[in-house]
Each structure stands twice: as structure tokens, then as C-alpha cells.
């Protein structure tokens, strides 16, 4: 067991042109905070994979208000270290993800708004107990300077925090087979770890995975009271006078509480008081909880079925991610039907419907012709969600309210002259052509019989609709 520690030294605009002046948006002042996530191994993990080695959130930093004329300084940062306790062995190789978050303090709907400003991901090798490692990383136009280290928490020592130490029983040397616990020369390596479940009160071991019983106890895990009080044949820490095993260590000897938990004895057992961020009988369960406020953008923190289980965030519509940190383009889901236009207003989704459709998602197909009278004898034709008028001759437009000039499109071919008529139009064809639109040439032996103009109309007369 141990703790990974991260110290942020500075976060600010990187060198070069185009560097941002301020982390805040135009909406007003903001402040920064950081999230660190540790994943085991050096393999490229999926972005959404859990922070299996642990995660931590910093406190919020001081409020930053941009001074337009002043040079952009290093930004005010939260105080203190970010600490990520780890329960098991330190893996040595790990992925370090540091996120810089911005909390906008302007007049936001629903309170402060959070957005991810920068994320750096590094794959690193690091031995526990070593010195601070320093690093500078760029994330877009931002630059982050930080140091980090992994340290073991007693009784664990070593580069992986797997060796256990405890105070020497004698001042001069360690017990048989146990080496001094460097660098703690006044401590010794602890006895090996017994078989899982071996009774803390009634069992002991000389080799890893063993479980040997003190007098009066039996069974594979030394949890069954023995009917005999004979000491013969038993070996182990013994009294020189009787040859029998003496009572073993108290339930708190060797501190069964992991991750810096403190042990207190209770009748026949023990109780661990765990540091913040750890839970469980032996403080073996680690992680951020709802008390740390991990859900952003109005997300609701929902604990697991019991206090030891991890939280989840239920995100408001429009946000997703394990901490509701990602804004969703809700219009990408195409919620508006029948060709409606989607508008994401932040606090709500709106659909602007095409003609002939209505409803919050344009799901209702209106009777296209209902209440849509076509003027001047036109008839309404439904289709495609928008009504259309089929107009009487001589009228046009959406509702047949516009007078139409049937000759405007020059329908008579080959120089024929067009005459508007109550029933449409008539073409007076040039010599040598015939047909309703003068489209056919007259055969050489044929004669054009069309009149120069229809009765009652002269070329050039204003249109008259009878």
C-alpha cells in the first residue's frame, strides 16, 4: 500500500503565438481545478477505461479574473498535493492522466458550468520510494509543469511497496531469517503473509501461504476450537518452560488496516478507522465518493448498493461521461422528425417543423389542406407535408391569388403569336407551321388553315379573362 502524489507547479499559456490569454471564457471569471487518473501498465488504454489505480480531484483554485492590459501570468492554482492512495503493490509502469478543468462562475443557468480545458496523458515507469520526478507537458496551447512520486506507507517498503516492515523485537538484530528493512535500519522485514483467511488471532505462518494454529485452535484457517489442550507436536513461537505455544499477537498487531487506517481492538476482533477515500473492513476499498462532488454539469451522484461501492453519475440530458463532463450534441441524434430543424438551446431541445407538421418533435402530420383554401377556383392537393394548389387557368401562385399570363413563357414555337383566351391560350402560327404550339412544320403540299387571330382577339390586346 502507498500513495501516489502529484504536485502541480504551474499551468498557463504555452510559449509562442496564439497562446490564450485567459482560461476563462467571455462569460466572466473562472477558477481551475485538476483531476488525476492512474491506470496500470504501459499499454494504450481506452479513454473511457476506469482509473484502476485510483483517481483524485483537487480543491478549486482561487477565482481568476482577466486583467486585459496585464501580461498573462501563471494562473492561480489550488493549494496542496493531489494524492491517490493505492491499496496493492505499486505496478512500476503506469499511465498518468492529468486533466485541467475550468469552473465558470458567471451567471450560469443551473449554477457553475464546468469544461475540460486540457488533458495530458503520459506513460511512465516509476519506482516507489524514489525522488520526485519533474515534467513539463503541453496540451494544445497550454503548458503544465508538475512533479510526481510514489511512496509506500508503513509497514510497506520497497520499490513496489510489497515488503512489510515492523519494529525489531530485539535491539541488536532481526529475527531468524528476517533481514533489516532498508532504509529503516531500526525495522525488520515482517513475517511472510499467511494463507488468505488465516485467523489473525489464532493462526501464524513461517512460510507464505501457510496457516498454522495456536494452541486450542484447529482447522485450515485456525477458526475451529480444539477439544484437546495438549501441546505435544506443535511448533511455533513457544514458551521455553512449557513447550506450548503462547497466545499469539493481538488483533491489531501488524496493523491489519490498509492504506493508513488505524486499528482499534474490539472484543474478539478489531475495527479500522479509515482515512478519507478508503472504505471496507480493512480500509481496502479506495476511490472517490459522492462526498467529493464528482458529478459535473448538474449530474446527480448515485452511490452503490452499499457504502463500499463506487459512485455513478446520472447525467442531465445533454451531458455524458463518467462525471457528466462531456457535452452531447443532442441534435446529432436527429430527434426532429419529418425534416424538422433541430435547435439545442442548452436548457431545452426545440424542433422547428416544416409546413404541415407539428408537435414537440414534428411527429404530427397535419391535414395539409385543412383550412387552406385555394382562391379563384383552385383545388388543394395534399402531399409531402405541405399543401399545394392546383390553380384554374389564368391563375397561379401558392394560393392561386396571382393572375397568370399564359403567354409569358412564350409557348408558341417557330415565331407563332400567342393570344390569351378564357380557356388558356391560342397560338397563331407563322406560315409553314401548325399544331397547338406551332410545333409541327407543314408539309410542302400542305396549307396552313389557321386564322391570323382567333375571333374577338387581336394581337397586342390586353389579356381579357371572360
Amino acid at each position: 500500500a502507498g500513495v501516489f502524489e502529484l504536485q502541480i507547479h504551474s499551468f498557463g499559456p504555452g510559449p509562442g503565438p496564439g497562446a490564450p490569454r485567459s482560461p476563462c471564457s467571455a462569460r466572466g471569471p473562472c477558477r481551475l481545478f485538476f483531476r488525476v487518473c492512474l491506470k496500470p501498465g504501459l499499454s494504450e488504454e481506452a479513454a473511457e477505461s476506469p482509473c484502476a489505480l485510483g483517481a483524485a480531484l483537487s480543491a478549486r483554485g482561487p477565482v481568476y479574473t482577466e486583467q486585459p492590459e496585464a501580461p498573462a501570468p501563471d494562473l492561480p492554482l489550488p493549494n496542496g498535493l493531489l494524492q491517490v492512495p493505492f491499496r496493492d503493490a505499486w505496478p512500476g509502469t503506469f499511465s498518468l492522466i492529468i486533466e485541467t478543468w475550468r469552473e465558470e462562475l458567471g451567471d450560469q443557468i443551473g449554477g457553475p458550468a464546468w469544461s475540460l480545458l486540457a488533458r495530458v496523458t503520459r506513460r511512465r515507469r516509476l519506482a516507489a520510494g524514489g525522488p520526485w520526478a519533474r515534467d513539463i507537458q503541453r496540451a494544445g496551447a497550454w503548458e503544465l509543469r508538475f512533479s510526481y512520486r510514489a511512496r509506500c506507507e508503513l509497514p510497506a517498503v520497497g520499490t513496489a511497496c510489497t515488503r512489510l516492515c515492523r519494529p525489531r523485537s530485539a535491539p541488536s538484530r532481526c529475527g531468524p531469517g528476517l533481514r533489516p528493512c532498508a532504509p529503516l535500519e531500526d525495522e525488520c522485514e515482517a513475517p511472510p503473509v499467511c494463507r488468505a483467511g488465516c485467523s489473525l488471532e489464532h493462526g501464524f505462518c513461517e512460510q507464505p501461504g501457510e496457516c498454522r494454529c495456536l494452541e486450542g485452535w484447529t482447522g485450515p484457517l485456525c477458526m475451529v476450537p480444539a477439544s484437546t489442550s495438549s501441546c505435544l507436536g506443535l511448533r511455533g513461537p513457544s514458551s521455553a518452560t512449557t513447550g506450548c505455544l503462547v497466545p499469539g499477537p493481538g488483533p491489531c498487531d501488524g496493523n491489519p488496516c490498509a492504506n493508513g487506517g488505524s486499528c482499534s481492538e474490539t472484543p474478539g476482533s478489531f475495527e479500522c478507522t479509515c482515512p478519507r477515500g478508503f472504505y471496507g473492513l480493512r480500509c481496502e476499498v479506495s476511490g472517490v465518493t459522492c462526498a467529493d462532488g464528482p458529478c459535473f454539469n448538474g449530474g446527480l451522484c448515485v452511490g452503490g448498493a452499499d457504502p463500499d461501492s463506487a459512485y455513478i453519475c446520472h447525467c442531465p440530458p445533454g451531458f455524458q461521461g463518467s462525471n457528466c463532463e462531456k457535452r452531447v450534441d443532442r441534435c446529432s441524434l436527429q430527434p426532429c422528425r419529418n425534416g424538422g430543424l433541430c435547435l439545442d438551446l442548452g436548457h431545452a431541445l426545440r424542433c422547428r417543423c416544416r409546413a404541415g407538421f407539428a408537435g414537440p418533435r414534428c411527429e404530427h402530420n397535419l391535414d395539409d389542406c385543412a383550412g387552406r383554401a385555394c382562391a379563384n377556383g383552385g383545388t388543394c392537393v395534399e402531399g409531402g407535408g405541405a399543401h399545394r394548389c392546383s390553380c384554374a387557368l389564368g391563375f397561379g401562385g401558392r394560393d392561386c391569388r396571382e393572375r397568370a399570363d399564359p403567354c409569358a413563357a412564350r409557348p408558341c414555337a417557330h415565331g407563332g403569336r400567342c393570344y390569351a383566351h378564357f380557356s388558356g391560350l391560342v397560338c397563331a402560327c407563322a406560315p409553314g407551321y401548325m399544331g397547338s404550339r406551332c410545333e409541327f412544320p407543314v408539309h410542302p403540299d400542305g396549307v396552313s388553315a389557321l386564322p391570323a387571330a382567333p375571333p374577338g382577339l387581336r394581337p397586342g390586346d390586353p389579356q381579357r379573362y371572360l
Epitope: G110, G298, P316
Partner: antibody
Framework: QVQLQESGPGLVKPSETLSLTCTVS????????WSWIRQPPGKGLEWIGY???????NYNPSLKSRVTISVDTSKNQFSLKLSSVTAADTAVYYC????????????WGQGTLVTVSS | EIVLTQSPGTLSLSPGERVTLSCRAS???????LAWYQQRPGQAPRLLIY???SRATGIPDRFSGSGSGTDFTLTISRLEPEDFAVYYC?????????FGGGTKLEIK
């Protein structure tokens, strides 16, 4: 503007299941979380649980073993079922929409009184 | 769960007066995820304030909210006759969602 209307029997016998429906108008049920809250006569408000259109639910632990909230997007309705009722479940039951900027309640139905009595 | 305690339970005041209602949480309410509601007799509650200090749509500016952490207040700068009702606070930081016991504002 979203409007909500509770419906269901006003009298339920002890040990039976209370069933209420909330009909949503003026908005799509697919846009919000939807919740039930109750208020015993002369007392304060108690959150029962909520449902999202996708089916995600979350219930008050004090009622979890007896509560089911479900949603019917085709009818723009969501419903509450509370089993094994006793006189202590007598209350005005409200349906409400949860805001899009956080889990508070921006629109409420007018409430319906459910009495548990034999 | 977060327990919200409202005080006082009942308050007798006259129209025109200024009033401050208190809501105290048993644990820190992160991100100021706290709302206030007004409930008039025989009516459903109505949202007044969310995010501890943001007024809901259509709420008069005589209503204001403040506070953070575990202590929150609702202030009505000048009481109108229609303001005499019961006021509830609600946290939405973590599940289960919880309400305060309410403060009843009655006419003196």
C-alpha cells in the same frame, strides 16, 4: 410549456398495489427525467424516484423494495406502482419533470390524493 | 443521505417585511446543488431558486438565494400577501434526493 396530469384511483386497500399514471403534454417525454414525489397530509415532501425515457431508474432507498416507475414514450406517459401499501402511504402524489440543468423539479402536476383504507 | 434542516418551522410576519429562511445540510452540498420551492395551500410546489442562487423563470426579483457548503438561505426582500406559504429546500447533489421539513410563513 410542459404540463403534467396525474390519474389513478383515489382509494386503495391495504396490502394492494397503488398505481398512478402521469400524462405529459406540451413536451416530449424523451427530453427529460420524470419523477414522483409524495406528501402525506399536513407533512413535508418525500421523493419517491425517477425514470428516464431510456429506462434508467433511481428510487428512494426507503421505498425501493416496493416501487416501480416506468415510462411509455408512445403515449407520452410515465407511471408509478407502489406495492403492499399501508395507511402510512396515504398522501398527495405529485408527478414532476426534472430540469435539464440538474435534478430539481421545474414542472409539477397538480397532485392526486391517494387514501389507503379498507 | 443528506438531511436538510429548515428553521424556523413557522414564522409570523407582516406584508412589507424582509425575511430570511435557513436550510442547513448534514453534509456538504457540492456544487451548490440546492433548490427552493414555494407551496401555497392546496397547490403543488413551485420552483423558486436552483443552483442555490439562480431564480427560476418568472420568479420576482424579491426572491433571492445564497449560501454554499452546508448553510443556505432564501431571502424575500419585501413580503407580498401572496408570499405567505410553506417554503422547502431540496438538495440534488447526491441520491437520494431530499427535501427539508419546510418553513411556514404566516401573516402576523
Amino acid at each position: 410549456q410542459v404540463q403534467l396530469q396525474e390519474s389513478g384511483p383515489g382509494l386503495v386497500k391495504p396490502s394492494e398495489t397503488l398505481s398512478l399514471t402521469c400524462t405529459v403534454s406540451g413536451g416530449s417525454i424523451s427530453s427529460y427525467y420524470w419523477s414522483w414525489i409524495r406528501q402525506p397530509p399536513g407533512k413535508g415532501l418525500e421523493w419517491i424516484g425517477y425514470v428516464y425515457y431510456s429506462g434508467t431508474t433511481n428510487y428512494n432507498p426507503s421505498l425501493k423494495s416496493r416501487v416501480t416507475i416506468s415510462v411509455d414514450t408512445s403515449k407520452n406517459q410515465f407511471s408509478l406502482k407502489l406495492s403492499s401499501v399501508t395507511a402510512a402511504d396515504t398522501a398527495v402524489y405529485y408527478c414532476a419533470s426534472i430540469a435539464v440543468t440538474g435534478f430539481y423539479f421545474d414542472y409539477w402536476g397538480q397532485g392526486t390524493l391517494v387514501t389507503v383504507s379498507s | 443521505e443528506i438531511v436538510l434542516t429548515q428553521s424556523p418551522g413557522t414564522l409570523s410576519l407582516s406584508p412589507g417585511e424582509r425575511v430570511t429562511l435557513s436550510c442547513r445540510a448534514s453534509q456538504r452540498v457540492n456544487n451548490n446543488y440546492l433548490a427552493w420551492y414555494q407551496q401555497r395551500p392546496g397547490q403543488a410546489p413551485r420552483l423558486l431558486i436552483y443552483g442555490a442562487s439562480s431564480r427560476a423563470t418568472g420568479i420576482p426579483d424579491r426572491f433571492s438565494g445564497s449560501g454554499s457548503g452546508t448553510d443556505f438561505t432564501l431571502t424575500i426582500s419585501r413580503l407580498e400577501p401572496e408570499d405567505f406559504a410553506v417554503y422547502y429546500c431540496q438538495q440534488y447533489d447526491r441520491s437520494p434526493l431530499t427535501f427539508g421539513g419546510g418553513t411556514k410563513l404566516e401573516i402576523k
